[in-house]
Interface confidence: low
């Protein structure tokens, strides 16, 4: 037998330094967890003590913090060449910068393989890309070797910027080929690497014929087998065991997000390259795991240029920006509007000629605004400004959902109206009256909203069976501030981009801005 | 960029064999995947087999299976082909060929110069 | 009998354009194998030309594009020159043969 020990990290969106225990900004050291500097202990602790180990992430490094805002990418390849990564599957924020953003900082730069044998390119781009990233690759671990083969989500075109020169096949499709052929080259030990979330990870542990082991991402999965050691909920035991469609077990594993768990599955093989046995549990990097002083010592190096970029301009505003709590939680605010605008901007997708994007509502809830911005300083805004505004540290998220699951938030927005309470809802691409004298759960009486399958956009009423896309806060999306229908009904959940990020691009896309309150949410009373 | 430089040209007899030498400089040889190719006089091309000197194991086309024998010396960097049993038909240019690096594509970007093997009767 | 079916042979003027069709079956192309192509100029050892469908190695001209619908895949020249009159091979990977197949080669004659 021969035991292999895999680290595996997903979705660790720009967390290089160390963050709270939610994984937003580091308060109090004491009790921060992540951050590269403790994993690298940890998994040098791990290299030093067992002998076949891989350290392998499913995706999704780019896009979370400011780190990525200023750095575009090459924090990524940085410090994860520093840790001696050995693989890398594509996440679908791996495009956010489009192809040129991916290509420079991060498959030019690092190097450990980057892959995803679903991803197809053609055109100019083809020769421009050729060999930067990888289908599979075989790597010697110990006297014997490992195939890994890695896969992206095919809803990139939908949640990125891919371009038109990338196609994006079926996972399972374009996987068994590759898994074929590894078969051929005597590669007895697969792994499937890849960014599809949970769902998919279990599909290609059923139908994808040869793969041993899924490490995945994406969907921010946590698993964990006995006491979890935090405040995460696991979605089943770590490993997920699934029975594939030839009769074997195979170990799916993901490790949540934002490098605050180092996952870690010891898998033993027989010769013939079968999975005798397989077990492990994601690591908490809590603070009884030292920052290695090397990293932190680059961290800090690094860290000297945000400090710089926080306090730079990046547009202007003519008018008051009221993120006030007496506006954003009682009435349409220009706060809420200008945010929403950003939200909806930053999903522009023309990916089908019938629609004119495929996106084009956003709710926001008032209680995430947490300050205005006032104008009469020369009307500057920095990324500092929309900090205070939005401090959370959270992304601007797309989800699907049905009308009646969006007539419920509404209803829920106003249910006890005039308490200044954080569900009212801010909107973009809706219209939305409300009357305050009728019952609660009964108070929308209006609700229309702006169509995406048209040449010329203008308001429809809402259908209660229709599906329609939103983006709005993860927090929401989680069922934050009460909304639980969203969490429960939501049919389609994809990680978005960080919520000051998209304002800040939008702001330096728009260089001088005047959002207005201009009847998005109004009040009336009486008969209708 | 790793080079393949094989052996000279040989004339056998029919029911003999041949072995053929590839050379590999200028890369990591054990990682690399060597496949042989042969092309008989106005023919095309036909893959015979291949083997990546870090799994020691090789694969054979169904076709020359039982026939050939491809193995790989890592101290040398020197990729071999066998070929037992030799007819008339077996007259063709051998080429070793690499894909550069195992898994980066399973083309064949580095190839050899190609040696001639003629079998007499 | 090659695996893999393309013309015997294909001919242009210079400065025109020309395809090169390779076609395969449910075992090898249309299973979602690789397609790459091959260039071999008289008395030289073949040269890679395209792989993975439509990506050129460096120092391929973008002359050369690929692309594969179904079971076949095809290898464009557009703006023909005479140093393109070469044999022009596919090759693939078949999960019946459990190897790498080529095809018959193409010879192509710049007029």
């Known amino acids: 037998a021969w035991e292999l020990t895999i680290l595996h990290t997903n979705d660790v969106h720009s967390r290089l330094e160390q963050t709270s225990e939610d994984s937003s900004k580091c308060v109090n050291a004491s009790r921060c967890m992540g951050g590269v500097a403790r994993l690298f202990t940890k998994v040098q602790q791990i290299r030093r003590a067992e002998p076949n180990v891989l350290l392998l992430d499913a995706g999704d490094q780019y896009q979370g913090t400011i780190w990525f805002t200023v750095y575009k990418g090459a924090e990524v390849a940085h410090f994860m060449n520093a840790l001696r990564y050995d693989a890398m599957a594509l996440g679908n924020h791996e495009f956010d910068n489009g192809v040129e953003g991916l290509i420079e900082p991060l498959l030019k730069e690092a190097k450990f393989p980057i892959l995803s044998a679903n991803i197809k390119a053609k055109g100019p781009l083809a020769s421009q890309i050729s060999g930067l990233y990888l289908p599979y690759k075989v790597l010697p671990v110990g006297d014997e070797v490992v195939g890994i083969v890695g896969y992206t989500s095919k809803e990139t075109p939908f949640l990125s910027n891919p371009g038109t020169n990338l196609v994006f096949e079926d996972e399972i499709t374009a996987l068994q080929p590759e898994v074929d052929k590894l078969k051929t080259l005597n590669v007895n030990k697969i792994i499937a690497l890849g960014h599809s979330g949970f769902e998919m990870d279990k599909l290609i542990a059923q139908k994808v014929r040869g793969v041993d082991v899924v490490v995945g991402g994406h969907s921010n999965t946590f698993l964990y087998t006995g006491n979890p050691p935090s405040k995460e909920v696991p979605a089943g035991k770590y490993p997920f065991i699934v029975t594939s469609d030839d009769g074997r077990k195979v170990p799916v594993v993901q490790a949540y997000a934002f490098g605050k768990y180092l996952g870690y599955l010891k898998i033993e093989f027989d010769e013939r390259g079968n999975v005798i046995s397989s077990h492990g549990n994601p690591i908490l990097l809590n603070s009884s795991i030292p920052e290695d002083p090397s990293i932190k010592a680059d961290i800090n190096k690094w860290r000297i240029k945000l400090d710089n970029y926080s306090t730079q301009e990046l547009g202007k505003t003519i008018v008051y920006l009221d993120g006030s709590s007496q506006s954003c939680r009682f009435r349409e605010c220009n706060m809420g509007n200008l945010i929403c605008d950003a939200m909806i901007n930053n999903n522009l997708r023309h990916t089908d000629e019938m629609f004119w994007n495929h996106v084009s509502m956003c709710i926001l809830n008032g209680g995430g605004i947490r300050s205005p911005i006032d104008e009469r300083n020369n009307g500057t805004i920095t990324w500092e400004n929309l900090a205070a505004v939005l401090p959370f540290g959270g992304t601007f998220d797309l989800v699907q959902l049905k009308g009646s699951t969006l007539k419920k938030a509404f209803e829920h927005s106003v249910h006890r109206y005039g308490q200044s309470t954080g569900e009212f809802l801010q909107v973009g691409g809706i219209h939305v009256v409300y009357d305050l004298s009728r019952k609660p759960g009964d108070r929308v009486v209006k609700l229309d909203v702006l169509c995406t399958k048209c040449r010329v956009p203008s308001y429809d009423p809402l259908k209660m069976d229709e599906v329609y896309k939103v983006i709005l806060p993860n927090f929401l999306a989680n069922g934050g501030d009460g909304f639980q229908m969203i969490k429960d009904e939501l049919l389609r959940h994809d990680s978005g981009d960080q919520d000051i990020n998209v304002v800040s691009t939008y702001i330096s896309k728009m260089k001088v801005i005047y959002p207005a309150v201009e009847g998005r949410i109004k009040f009336s009373t009486g008969s209708h | 960029q790793v080079q393949l430089v094989q052996s000279g040209a040989e004339v056998k007899k029919s029911g003999s064999s041949v072995k053929v030498s590839c050379k590999a400089s200028?890369?990591?040889?054990?990682?690399?995947?060597i496949s042989w190719v042969r092309q008989a006089p106005g023919q095309g091309l036909e893959w015979m087999g291949m083997i990546i000197p870090i799994f020691g194991t090789a694969n054979y086309a169904q076709k020359f299976q039982g026939r050939v024998t491809i193995t790989a010396d890592e101290s040398t960097s020197i990729a071999y082909m066998e070929l037992s049993s030799l007819r008339s038909e077996d007259t063709a240019v051998y080429y070793c060929a690499s894909d550069g690096a195992v898994a980066a594509y399973d083309a064949f970007l580095i190839w050899g110069q190609g040696t001639m093997v003629t079998v007499s009767s | 009998q090659a695996v893999l079916t393309q013309p015997s042979s294909v001919s242009g003027a210079p400065g025109q354009r020309v395809t090169i069709s390779c076609t395969g079956t449910?075992?090898?192309?249309?299973?979602?194998?690789?397609i790459h192509w091959y260039q071999q100029l008289p008395g030289t050892a073949p040269k890679l030309l395209m792989y993975r469908f439509s990506r050129r190695p460096s120092g391929v001209p973008d002359r050369f594009s690929g692309s594969k619908s179904g079971t076949s895949a095809s290898l464009t020249i557009t703006g023909l020159q005479v140093e393109d009159e070469a044999d022009y091979y596919c090759q693939s990977y078949d999960s019946g043969q459990r190897g790498w197949v080529f095809g018959g080669g193409t010879k192509l004659t710049v007029l």
């Open positions: 449910s075992s090898n192309i249309g299973a979602g194998f690789d």
């Open positions: 200028g890369g990591t040889f054990s990682s690399y995947a």
